[in-house]
């Protein structure tokens, strides 16, 4: 960067090279050029010459003052106008940064995705700091009192093999940068309570052209967890509001869920699961799109037609289908 240049003098920043965004700062440039009493000293920010708020301090030094500096990063350098020199002479350069001290990390969450072999811990870091901010994740066994620390820039994956201190732990996060340090509240976890089942995936959909057309959604998970609760949400792609259906599921076979939907409409489906009675859900699965066919059966009652198509009731019976979808994208 700019800091690697050969200097004929030096440049420094007050209060510091890394400072709080919005502060007033002063950048000083002091020339030490052989056979040159500088006529003028010039400052450049990101290659653009600065025009205002430059004050000469003495024969060799000038100050550039910025009010309410808001740029996260800038490369500064200064030059001298030497008598009998046609071009400006480079004095020195420095990279400067502005940002914020970290907020207190909150919403610390640790989960074990089934089969991953890792405990994944995440948190809400708060407002953007703009400067290099490091996080230390502390994991302390409540059984052995042993504490381990993990350094990261965002989230952390901790191998479950390294968690040798039993099942119960305290987890907390420390955030630190050049402008400050903060620590989260402690989260108490039990390894058995934080497992998230293997991802549930919608594999296909089919609409059966019966008296009342019905759509069957096929979905599955590779989980070995016995008691799993799932939710499937669906809506017409033109709608804002989701319909949600709940299931107690046994994944020893592919799940089939039946819906009565409006004809000739594109729907989107998503599913998620959790170990029954536990805290953490899977994220919603990728959107699965299915368009119902145009054919509208003859129905005597408009009210009945309307109610049935909008009910979205799940039916226990299983049927073989005619119109099939297998499109994960749009």
């Amino acid at each position: 960067g700019i800091t690697n240049i050969n200097c004929s003098g030096h440049i420094w920043v007050e209060p510091a090279t890394i400072f709080k965004m919005g502060m007033n700062i002063s950048i000083y440039c002091q020339a030490a050029i052989k056979n040159c009493q500088p006529r003028k000293l010039h400052f450049y920010k990101n290659g653009i010459k600065e025009r205002f708020q430059i004050t000469r301090i003495n024969k060799t030094t000038a100050r550039l003052w910025y009010k309410n500096f808001l740029e996260p990063h800038a490369s500064m350098y200064c030059t001298a106008e030497c008598p009998k020199h046609f071009q400006e002479t480079l004095i020195c350069g420095k990279d400067i940064s502005s940002g914020y001290p970290p907020d207190i990390p909150d919403e610390v969450t640790c989960v074990i995705y089934e089969y991953s072999g890792n405990m994944t811990c995440t948190w809400n870091a708060g407002k953007l700091t703009y400067i290099d901010t490091k996080y230390v994740v502390h994991v302390k066994s409540l059984e052995t009192e042993e504490e381990q620390q993990y350094l990261t820039s965002s989230y952390i994956n901790i191998s479950t093999d390294s968690l040798q201190g039993g099942k119960k732990y305290l987890v907390w996060v420390q955030a630190a940068n050049a402008l400050g340090m903060e620590e989260s509240k402690q989260l108490q976890i039990h390894l058995d309570d934080i497992v998230i089942p293997s991802a549930a995936v919608i594999s296909r959909a089919e609409t059966i052209n019966a008296t009342v057309p019905k759509t069957i959604i096929y979905w599955d998970s590779q989980t070995t967890i016995e008691k799993v609760s799932c939710e499937m949400r669906y809506k017409a792609t033109t709608n804002q509001t989701w319909n949600v259906k709940e299931f107690d599921t046994n994944f020893t076979y592919v799940q089939q869920s039946e819906f009565y939907l409006e004809p000739n409409i594109k729907y989107v489906f998503q599913v998620r699961c959790q170990e029954t009675g536990k805290r953490y859900w899977q994220p919603w699965s990728s959107p699965f799109f299915h368009k119902t066919p145009e054919t509208v059966p003859q129905v005597t009652s408009k009210a009945f037609q309307h109610d049935t198509w909008n009910s979205g009731l799940t039916v226990a019976s299983i049927s073989t289908g005619h119109l099939t979808s297998d499109n994960r994208g749009d």
Partner: antibody
Framework: QVQLVESGGGVVQPGRSLRLSCAAS????????MSWVRQAPGKGLDLVAD??????????YYADSVKDRFTISRDNSKNTLYLQMNSLRAEDTAVYYC??????????WGQGTLVTVSS | DIQMTQSPSSLSASVGDRVTITCRAS??????LAWYQQKPGKAPKLLIY???SLQDGVPSRFSGSGSGTDYTLTISSLQPEDFATYYC?????????FGQGTKVEIK
């Protein structure tokens, strides 16, 4: 050689607007700072507005007396400097000179254009 | 802004006289000073820049000197065409500022 020709001066009523132009030739226009310097009758020279060169990202400066009323601009493709003068006052009456600066002193000047603000 | 004070505000002199005009800055301007000559109805003309450098085409009877806050324009032998008003300009700190002018009149 360097030539600067101002135009657009004249008699105008207080509160009205006027736009001055300065056509430049004989130098690399975008590499030079351009200024408007005025001289009230029988008085000294005053920098009114300045628009700097490309290396300064064309930063502008205005004297306190004209801030929020005057706007300096340049069209590098036409080698022309402008001064848009709004809400003119009697005290804006002066000869307005267009001037060139490479360093910060004014190297070349136009012949000037007279602006008279009178009711 | 840096204030520039010129003295005298006017002077009377004869052809052949040595004339000295001074300019004082409110702070050190590190030889960033220019001198201009202005004749009635005409634009100012640059005579000297960087306190002592003569602009191309300017007669050698004009010279400039000084450092720190005090600067001088000297006309070694006044000529008829030199009767005019002279201005100093500091360009050490932005914005550049002019002195109030010195009028050189025929005695």
């Amino acid at each position: 050689q360097v030539q600067l020709v101002e135009s657009g001066g004249g008699v105008v009523q207080p509160g009205r607007s006027l736009r001055l132009s300065c056509a430049a030739s004989g130098f690399d226009f975008s590499s030079y700072g351009m200024s408007w310097v005025r001289q009230a009758p029988g008085k000294g020279l005053d920098l009114v507005a300045d628009i700097n060169s490309k290396s300064y990202n064309y930063a502008t400066y205005y004297a306190d007396s004209v801030k929020d009323r005057f706007t300096i601009s340049r069209d590098n493709s036409k080698n022309t400097l402008y001064l848009q003068m709004n809400s003119l006052r009697a005290e804006d009456t002066a000869v307005y000179y267009c001037a060139v600066h490479h360093s910060d002193y004014f190297e070349y000047w136009g012949q000037g254009t007279l602006v008279t603000v009178s009711s | 802004d840096i204030q520039m004070t010129q003295s005298p505000s006017s002077l009377s002199a004869s052809v052949g006289d040595r004339v000295t005009i001074t300019c004082r800055a409110s702070q050190d301007i590190y030889t960033n000073l220019a001198w201009y000559q202005q004749k009635p109805g005409k634009a100012p003309k640059l005579l000297i820049y960087h306190a002592s450098s003569l602009q191309d085409g300017v007669p050698s009877r004009f010279s400039g000197s000084g450092s720190g806050t005090d600067y001088t324009l000297t006309i070694s032998s006044l000529q008829p065409e030199d009767f005019a008003t002279y201005y100093c300009l500091q360009d050490s700190e932005y914005p550049p500022t002019f002195g109030q002018g010195t009028k050189v009149e025929i005695k």
